[in-house]
């Protein structure tokens, strides 16, 4: 079946700025028209596309949640970049929300890694040096990193 055989019977209503597809694909920052004849620009700050594509619509921009800071705004070619606020982090296995970092390590453990937007503080057993991955105790006890020096909070 040729494209001529399948010529569309109607044209889509005019929308944003248009250009022509290249080999049936539109460049980043655009989506394709229903009839495949035009590339239509995404709306700045509303939607985006990152790759050459033949999709009928651009992808909706992410809105940063409360508890997140916007590192960079949404453009027509790149989604918003959001990051957890200081003192909170987002884990890979629970990406839907920022969680508060622990303020210290359980008894018998020392802090070896700070709170970052991507990870909680990292604690290891004093003696063995193995990482702690268990739940935080009900009553969190801040332990000393070295004699007389309290473990530092997330920064």
């Amino acid at each position: 079946i040729t494209q001529q055989d399948l010529a569309p019977q109607q044209r889509a209503a005019p929308q944003q700025k248009r250009s022509s597809p290249s080999e049936g694909l539109c460049p980043p920052g655009h989506h394709i028209s229903e009839d495949g004849r035009d590339c239509i620009s995404c709306k700045y700050g509303q939607d985006y596309s990152t790759h050459w594509n033949d999709l009928l619509f651009c992808l909706r921009c992410t809105r940063c949640d409360s508890g997140e800071v916007e590192l960079s705004p949404c453009t027509t070619t790149r989604n918003t970049v959001c990051q957890c606020e200081e003192g909170t982090f987002r884990e890979e296995d629970s990406p839907e929300m920022c969680r508060k970092c622990r303020t210290g390590c359980p008894r018998g453990m020392v802090k070896v890694g700070d709170c970052t937007p991507w990870s909680d503080i990292e604690c290891v057993h004093k003696e063995s040096g193995t990482k702690h991955s268990g739940e935080v105790p009900a009553v969190e006890e801040t332990v000393t990193s070295s004699p007389g020096t309290p473990a530092s909070p997330c920064s």
Epitope: Q3, E34, D54, L55, L56, F57
Partner: nanobody, 123 residues
């Protein structure tokens, strides 16, 4: 979850008519196309017709132009294929499918498929 339910298939004599329906649920895309494909025994699945939701752009395969008409009911999320002047070579299982790509007349451009409804044209 996208679900497509075809209906309206059956047996008809040459020159007769049938209307196929495809009801879609679970579609949350800003725009999409719904197409009809058919597959005769021992043959590859082939494009028949497609219609787009926002602009209403329509496509037909050359073999059905002037005999088949595709239409949509936006409120019901349903697409129809009115088939007339049916021929023995129109006998096939007719599938409804959904695409989020433009100018979608190839099978691989469709992401969601119905189970199909059988159309038999026989005297």
């Amino acid at each position: 979850e996208v679900q497509l339910l075809e209906s309206g298939g059956g047996e008809v004599q040459p020159g007769g008519s049938l209307r196929l329906s495809c009801a879609a649920s679970g579609l949350t895309f800003p725009n999409y196309g719904m197409g009809w494909f058919r597959q005769a025994p021992g043959k590859e699945r082939e494009f028949v017709s497609a219609i787009y939701w926002s602009g209403g752009t329509v496509y037909y395969a050359e073999s059905v132009k002037g005999r088949f008409t595709i239409s949509r009911d936006n409120a019901k999320n349903t697409v129809y294929l009115q088939m007339s002047s049916l021929r023995a070579e129109d006998t096939a299982v007719y599938y409804c499918a959904v695409t989020i790509r433009g100018a979608a007349t190839q099978t691989w451009k469709y992401d969601y498929w119905g189970q199909g409804t059988l159309v038999t044209v026989s005297s």
